[in-house]
């Protein structure tokens, strides 16, 4: 070989300065007598070489790299020859930094494994090959005093955990443990940890099971679960506090932690949680009062809440068929008493017989909000409950009794917006207890079936606005009934829109009769129009050649109208107007030409 | 120092009852658990039963499960063996003994003499 | 339920021997095993506990091995007042299980 690099160290710090050099021996004769060393860091000519002749006859280049930035390169020693570069010799350098400390040292102790497992962070990257040795020793003290060695634990490549087996352990014993980080340019030592092995145990979580429920216990409560836990037997023995964590499985809610409860709880009831929904639990442990390390969590048990009766009170309105009196069609609301009031499965209205103690006679179990039924004759009150598989709510009485009440006076309707109207009327004296107001389509689409309702708890109310099922163009029919303490007023009903539209098209126009100076014209009226308010008024207009109008306001019942004081032989352009309350429309333009002084009346 | 001391032992006929103490002294008592250990003569340590620290957890070997009771009273520092349906196989000398963490039986009484005969 | 297989059941040594007595357990019980010395008359005493590890105040010379389910007591070398009868225990699952024990006679 011709050439032969040394350099001043083959690893250094990142960033610090290399000095290298190259010599050449004089047996080299395929070679120039004075030859150019040239000298590259990887693909690149590196300036700078200082080349000599030494007294030998080998020629010598030095070269001080200033700053090696790179983790690892390569530095070649090169030749000119020929049109291309020949290397003589290279060397392999790198760039990094010693060990940092290895930080966050900690250890757990696995009592299934029997190993003390211990991890640590190894710092910022040191770019060079860098060894990591779990070193500890046994002590009796506080590890002040060192006792016997433990074999070194060397983790495998790039791992930052390290396993110490049982038979390098001494259990409630302490330990110093410590890692050693060392590579090329230095060797680093964690802090020290003295610990007893036993004082890291990280135990298995308990199993989480629902409680199989037994014929003699009372059934949890609404808004309770009801669990227990299968504690894990190889940590039967330590002490141990646990807590739950909770959170309803729909929804974005957080976990909810419930604790400390000693492992030995074994059942328990966790209340104060929403009725009826899907609950994820778990449970996670802890040596205590010695120290230890917090289990993972359990795996997850799913528990649905009971749920709770409805609590809500019932306002009811009912009606009786014309045609069969004993046939009633009642209608309840529920209104929620609290803000979770329990879900509705559904609603029974039952009868109970005078006389019959404890017989109920069902007359229709239903979840819609009405039902359709035959009274018994001897029938005056009947029991409206909503229920679901808690239970029920408490009953409503519904008592069927005359009109015997007061009437209300002065009932008027007035529309709001075209979704709205405002029922208003005067209270009778005395006040009622409350009011019901019932509003569906008015005459020709009239139906009771079809009617809304809505009960007003306020006897001292002197309107209510609907805002349910109120459509613009449509003639409403609104019935409201005062309620007293055992009957109930007559109803009073009125009828209204909430948005009237304009006539669609005003009646077409015809001449019936013409003249030098006159002309007779007449319409058919348009028939009426549902959504569509009566016509308060026609305006006819004309206008002659010259562009002058005139106009003249007829009442709604014309059908027909002359114009007088026309000009003879003159061409006029009529139209009619409707007018309502809700807008008004055109008519097309009638064009008609009066006669020539001399020309004979047309009839 | 660690001390246990059984009491409560001796003779009583099959059918009959019988109700084993343990006081003990020298740790902590309510922090531990606390078992019930029988040799019967001439044979080898059958566990009876056991208890946690605070009494929640009472497992039992399956020969007396349903007619041996076991509790403590950590106020007294003292555990007890309700023994009920007593039977010949029953005679032993019943140890008490308190429990580490790792289940092992640290301290033993020195055993009170059970004889079921009629 | 885990039983506990103890061999030999019994054996005779001189002063100075050193003797193994083996314990098989019928499933994993990791290193959940002690050992325990009876002598006649008096109660059982703590030896090792959890496979290997020796109990306060315990004679060095014994020393525990073995984990699963084969496990070991070895008294290196035998003492006049290590003739007793040796019980293994297996603490990992209830119920609890003792050893059919080993008796270590004089020969």
């Known amino acids: 070989e011709c050439g032969h690099i040394s350099v001043s160290a083959p690893i250094v710090h990142l960033g610090d300065p290399i000095t290298a050099s190259c010599i050449i021996k004089q047996n080299c004769s395929h070679l120039d007598p004075e030859p150019q060393i040239l000298w590259r860091l990887g693909a690149e000519l590196q300036p700078g070489g200082r080349q000599q002749r030494l007294s030998d006859g080998t020629q010598e280049s030095i070269i001080t790299l200033p700053h090696l930035n790179h983790t690892q390169a390569f530095l070649s020693c090169c030749l000119n020859w020929g049109n291309s570069l020949q290397i003589l010799d290279q060397v392999e350098l790198r760039a990094g930094y010693p060990p940092a400390i290895p930080h966050n040292l900690s250890c757990l102790m696995n009592l299934t494994t029997s190993s003390l497992i211990c991890q640590w962070e190894p710092g910022p990257e040191t770019h060079l090959p860098t060894s990591f040795t779990l070193k500890s020793f046994k002590s009796r003290g506080n590890c002040q005093t060192q006792g016997d060695s433990i074999l070194d634990c060397v983790p495998k490549d790039g791992q930052s955990h390290c396993c110490i087996p049982r038979k390098h352990l001494l259990l409630y014993q302490n330990m110093g443990i410590w890692v050693q980080a060392e590579n090329a340019l230095g060797t680093s030592m964690s802090p020290q940890l003295c610990l007893d092995p036993m004082d890291v145990v990280k135990l298995e979580p308990p199993m989480l099971r629902t409680m199989d429920p037994s014929p003699e216990a009372a059934p949890p409560q609404a808004g309770c679960l009801q669990l227990c836990w299968e504690p894990w037997q190889p940590g039967l023995h330590i002490n141990q506090k646990c807590e739950l964590r909770h959170k309803p499985q729909r929804g974005e809610a957080s976990w909810a932690l419930v604790g400390p409860l000693p492992l030995e709880a074994l059942q328990y009831e966790l209340c104060g949680l929403l009725p009826a929904t899907a609950y994820t639990l778990q449970i996670r442990c802890i040596r205590w009062p010695l120290p230890g390390h917090w289990s993972d969590w359990s795996p997850s048990l799913e528990l649905r809440t009971t749920e709770r009766a409805p609590t809500v009170r019932l306002d009811t309105w009912w009606r009786q068929r014309q045609l069969d009196p004993r046939t009633v069609q009642l209608f309840w609301k529920p209104v929620p008493l609290e803000e979770d009031s329990g879900r509705i499965q559904g609603y029974v209205v039952s009868w109970r017989p005078s006389g019959q103690a404890g017989a109920i006679l069902p007359l229709c179990n239903t979840t819609e909000l009405s039902c359709t039924f035959h009274l018994p004759s001897e029938a005056q009150e009947v029991a409206l409950v909503a229920y679901n598989s808690a239970g029920t709510s408490r009953p409503t009485p519904v008592v069927f009794s005359e009109s015997r009440g007061p009437a209300l006076t002065r009932l008027h309707a007035m529309a709001r917006d075209p979704h709205s109207l405002w029922v208003g009327w005067e209270p009778p004296n005395p006040w009622p207890q409350g009011y019901v107001i019932e509003w569906g389509l008015g005459p020709p689409s009239a139906s009771n079936s079809n009617k809304t309702w809505r009960m007003e708890q306020n006897g001292r109310a002197t309107g209510f606005l609907l805002k349910e099922n109120i459509r613009p163009f449509q003639l409403y029919e609104i019935i409201v009934t005062p309620l007293y303490q055992d009957t109930m007023g007559p109803s009073q009903h009125v009828y209204a829109y909430s948005q009237e539209m304009a006539p669609s098209h005003a009646p077409e126009l015809h001449l019936k009769h013409i003249g030098k100076t006159w002309a007779q014209l007449e319409w058919v009226p348009e028939p009426p129009e549902l959504g569509k308010s009566p016509l308060t008024h026609y305006t006819i207009f004309w206008t002659n050649a010259q562009n002058q109008s005139f106009s003249a306001i007829l009442n709604a019942s014309s059908r027909g109208f002359v114009l007088h004081g026309l000009e003879p032989a003159s061409l006029y352009h009529i139209h009619l107007m409707a007018a309502s309350q809700a807008g008004a429309t055109n008519s097309t333009v009638l064009t008609l030409m009066t006669l020539t002084p001399e020309g004979s009346e047309l009839h | 120092e660690v001390q246990l001391l059984e009491s409560g032992g001796g003779l009583v006929q099959p059918g009959g009852s019988l109700r084993l103490s343990c006081a003990a002294s020298?740790?902590?008592?309510?922090?531990?658990?606390m078992g019930w250990v029988r040799q019967a003569p001439g044979k080898g340590l059958e566990w009876v039963s056991s208890?946690?620290?605070?009494?929640?957890?009472?497992p039992y070997a399956d020969s007396v499960k349903g007619r041996f009771t076991i509790s403590r009273d950590n106020s007294k520092n003292t555990l007890y063996l309700q023994m009920n349906s007593l039977r010949a196989e029953d005679t032993a000398v019943y140890y008490c003994?308190?429990?580490?963490?790792?289940?092992?039986?640290?301290?033993w009484g020195q055993g009170t003499l059970v004889t079921v005969s009629s | 339920d885990i039983q506990m297989t103890q061999s030999p059941s019994s054996l005779s040594a001189s002063v100075g021997d050193r003797v193994t007595i083996t314990c098989r357990a019928s499933?994993?019980?990791?290193?959940?095993l002690n050992w325990y010395q009876q002598k006649p008359g008096k109660a059982p005493k703590l030896l090792i506990y959890?496979?290997?590890n020796l109990q306060n105040g315990v004679p060095s010379r014994f020393s525990g091995s073995g984990s699963g389910t084969d496990f070991t007591l070895t008294i290196s070398s035998l003492q006049p007042e290590d003739f007793a009868t040796y019980y293994c225990?297996?603490?990992?699952?209830?119920?609890?299980?003792f050893g059919g024990g080993t008796k270590v006679e004089i020969k």
């Open positions: 003994a308190k429990l580490g963490e790792l289940g092992q039986y640290m301290g």
């Open positions: 208890i946690s620290s605070s009494g929640g957890v009472t």
């Open positions: 020298g740790f902590t008592f309510s922090l531990y658990w």
């Open positions: 499933q994993g019980i990791s290193s959940y």
């Open positions: 959890y496979a290997s």
């Open positions: 225990q297996q603490s990992m699952w209830m119920p609890i299980f």
